[in-house]
Amino acid sequence: ITCPPPMSVEHADIWVKSYSLYSRERYICNSGFKRKAGTSSLTECVLNKATNVAHWTTPSLKCIRDPALVHQRPAPPSTVTTAGVTPQPESLSPSGKEPAASSPSSNNTAATTAAIVPGSQLMPSKSPSTGTTEISSHESSHGTPSQTTAKNWELTASASHQPPGVYPQGHSDTT
């Protein structure tokens, strides 16, 4: 059993090394942003025992604008990068807890809160996820639009468009 691709977090990137059960991955806030104190960038592939479906835990990560960069003069256009990330050290303890960011948390109204988009379900043969409080649990709608659709979607109830003879298995394995 493996996890599907994890959900995205605003102003953060993640490079997934392993989709195996119990693997842990870390989001990295994009350049110009930093991890808000008290939030965690970690996500773990866990098993919903009720449904035997693996999913990523929901990270509490919020990437906020780095106050240290607010008053800096913009770099010349030739040196500006748009896909850069700012690694931020965090310890990976067995308990999954990690130290808060070094800078104090403030009520910065300009701070950008993370909008978490649920991860994808790439195991259509699995039954819908139930009995979990994890936001990141995955529900399979078996070819019909999910009840929890992303905002502004306006779709007909037509069947999925899938390449002939190819199905969205992703990194999932059936056991």
Partner: nanobody
Framework: EVQLVESGGGLVQAGDSLRLSCIAS????????MGWFRQAPGNEREFVAS????????VYDDSVKGRFTISRDNAKNTVYLQMNSLKPEDTAAYYC??????????WGQGTQVTVSS
């Protein structure tokens, strides 16, 4: 109904670059998470990258780290996959997918990328 049409594939040499495009159309006001997957002959389809609606959150498979970049232009309803430093093992059919709610549900027909050594 949502239609996804990929383009930009082709035959290139190892080390070259390609940019794939995926144009989304249909009865939609805006698009949520979009992603790219690939499938080599005889292999399962595998995840490559995805991007959220605002374009600020990206997820990549570690195998493409530092080489592939996903981006989107909502004004053009287009998602891009910039592929640099291509390797023979990147040879596959590349599929664009749109996430509805919690799953990637809409799929394009794919575009073939072949990297020769």
């Amino acid at each position: 109904e949502v239609q996804l049409v990929e383009s930009g594939g082709g035959l290139v040499q190892a080390g070259d670059s390609l940019r794939l495009s995926c144009i989304a159309s249909g009865r939609t006001l805006s698009y949520p998470d979009m992603g790219w997957f690939r499938q080599a002959p005889g292999n399962e389809r595998e995840f490559v990258a995805s991007i959220n609606w605002s374009g600020t959150g990206r997820v990549y498979d570690d195998s493409v780290k530092g080489r592939f970049t996903i981006s989107r232009d909502n004004a053009k309803n287009t998602v891009y996959l910039q592929m640099n430093s291509l390797k023979p093992e990147d040879t596959a059919a590349y599929y664009c997918a749109a996430r509805v709610g919690t799953e990637f549900q809409y799929w394009g027909q794919g575009t073939q990328v072949t990297v020769s050594s």
